[in-house]
């Protein structure tokens, strides 16, 4: 019908009328080129180069990871994107100053077992939740 | 012991260290001020201003939400920080350049009930999940 | 071997603006940060800013934030620093530095001098 | 920020002599991130020491670091001529990066 071609249209006008010339904004980035789409970045983090190697015994280290990259419109299956940064993605566009974009942060967060002196010097064997990232998206 | 004050002083170490001097960074907010912290900003969004007009029949709009501020050392509290975040802060910065800050992210979302036309001109019910933004916190 | 090649000496006149070069070579360019530093006479060296190359994100001293630019060319393996507003008290020796992840700065340009005079 | 300040500020000895540069901070930070610079006239500083007591790449085992805490130790052991330059110590963990103001070791 007549309202359902209206209706598809306006959809696709939502999306179409998104697809626009990236506007360089004065950001960290240099705004000539842009920053990938959020993901996992390796990283592995020593507990000597945080200061803590007198009170950690084991792990010297682990691979922590991060998440880092754009949450740009428009979100594609790979960036984990809730509803709600699929809304605000669409919101940043039409209102830039106001909204920002989602940010790429862990979906997926993994523990470690860390060995370490207590205060009063024993030796503890404790479980550390959400250390690991192990998968990141567009929140 | 000798050995219980220099872990505690190593756990001091890593705190105060960071007690450095803030520094603007060429960021989209204007750094000659300190951007607050993480938190959760209102946010109403109307589906006409999406462009969804004529696809959504009810509601007209609701109260999306969205999180945005600074997920700066030290982490406290109301900033919900996960494990890793508090790690990365401080792998930050010591090495920003690298890192970035953890991120300003939503930590609880709640569903909104949706009445909408789909693609062959049906009125649908359906509960979205994930697109009101309840609280926020630094992943 | 890792190299940092900076470009040559600059005479400029106080409030005009002074662009330098830095030439890496002999390694990844694009996993580094580089570090732009300067040294005046007498005094002790004073950090401006760095550059991530493979992301462009980038940080400035708040000392130089409204003067100074930090640019890189991926393709050409090439940092920039641009100071604008030259006064008298920039006239220094400018380097730029790399600097690994947790690590010191590694390397080092051998500096260029810019002396600003009226 | 991390004011580091160095002492003597110049130290004038023979060569086979054994120099001993301070630098001290004025806050504790983790030694991972103490380095120490060596710089001629006219030249680029080259990175002798890192990590407060790591020497750097095809740097002679004369020069040795030591330290931790607020207080940092540069020694080089038996002068070589080429050894007379300023030696600058760096705080590289995190933004500001700062620097000594210079030791100039000369030839008394």
């Known amino acids: 019908s007549a309202s359902s071609r209206r209706r598809q249209q306006s959809r696709n006008r939502s999306t179409q009328s998104q697809d626009v010339a990236r506007v360089s904004s004065a950001s960290d980035y240099n705004s000539s080129e842009l920053k990938t789409a959020c993901r996992k970045h390796e990283l592995y983090v020593s507990f000597q180069d945080l200061g803590w190697q007198d009170w950690i015994i084991a792990p010297k280290g682990y691979a922590a990871n991060y998440c880092d990259g754009e949450c740009s419109f428009p979100l594609n299956a790979h960036m984990n994107a809730t509803n709600h940064a699929i809304v605000q993605t669409l919101v940043h566009l039409m209102n830039p100053e106001y909204v920002p974009k989602p940010c790429c942060a862990p979906t997926k967060l993994n523990a470690i077992s860390v060995l370490y002196f207590d205060d009063n010097s024993n030796v503890i064997l404790k479980k550390y939740r959400n250390m690991v990232v192990r998968a990141c998206g567009c929140h | 012991s000798a050995s219980s004050r220099r872990r505690q002083q190593s756990r001091n170490r890593s705190t105060q260290s960071q007690d450095v001097a803030r520094v603007s960074s060429a960021s989209d907010y204007n750094s000659s001020e300190l951007k607050t912290a993480c938190r959760k900003h209102e946010l109403y969004v109307s589906f006409q201003d999406l462009g969804w007009q004529d696809w959504i029949i009810a509601p007209k709009g609701y109260a999306a939400n969205y999180c945005d501020g600074e997920c700066s050392f030290p982490l406290n509290a109301h900033m919900n920080a996960t494990n890793h975040a508090i790690v990365q802060t401080l792998v930050h910065l010591m090495n920003p350049e690298y890192v970035p800050k953890p991120c300003c992210a939503p930590t609880k979302l709640n569903a909104i009930s949706v009445l909408y036309f789909d693609d062959n001109s049906n009125v649908i019910l359906k509960k979205y999940r994930n697109m009101v933004v309840r609280a926020c916190g630094c992943h | 071997q890792v190299q940092l090649v900076q470009s040559g000496a600059e005479v400029k006149k106080p409030g005009a603006s002074v662009k330098v070069s830095c030439k890496a070579t002999?390694?990844?360019?694009?996993?580094?940060?580089f570090h732009w530093v300067r040294q005046a006479p007498g005094q002790r060296f004073e950090w401006m800013g760095w550059?991530?190359?493979?992301?462009?994100?980038?940080e400035y001293s708040q000392k130089f934030q409204d003067r100074v630019t930090i640019t890189r060319d991926t393709s050409a393996t090439t940092v920039y620093m641009e100071l604008n507003s030259l006064k008298s008290e920039d006239t220094a020796m400018y380097f730029c530095?790399?600097?690994?992840?947790?690590?010191?700065?590694?390397?080092w340009g051998q500096g260029t001098l810019v002396t600003v005079s009226s | 920020e991390i004011v580091l300040t160095q002492s003597p500020g110049t130290l004038s000895l023979s060569p086979g002599e054994r120099a001993t540069l301070s630098c001290r901070a004025s806050?504790?930070?983790?030694?991972?991130?103490l380095a120490w610079y060596q710089q001629k006239p006219g030249q680029a500083p080259r990175l002798l020491v890192y990590?407060?007591?790591k020497r750097a790449t095809a740097i002679p085992d004369r020069f040795s670091g030591s330290g931790s805490g607020t207080d940092f130790i540069l020694t080089i052991n038996r002068l070589e001529p080429e050894d007379f330059a300023v030696y600058y110590c760096?705080?590289?963990?995190?933004?500001?990066?700062?620097f000594g103001r210079g030791t100039k070791v000369e030839i008394k």
């Open positions: 530095a790399r600097r690994p992840l947790w690590g010191p700065f590694d390397y």
């Open positions: 002999g390694f990844t360019f694009i996993t580094y940060a």
């Open positions: 550059i991530n190359v493979g992301n462009g994100n980038r």
């Open positions: 806050q504790i930070f983790s030694n991972t991130f």
């Open positions: 990590g407060a007591s």
């Open positions: 760096q705080h590289y963990g995190g933004s500001p990066w700062t």
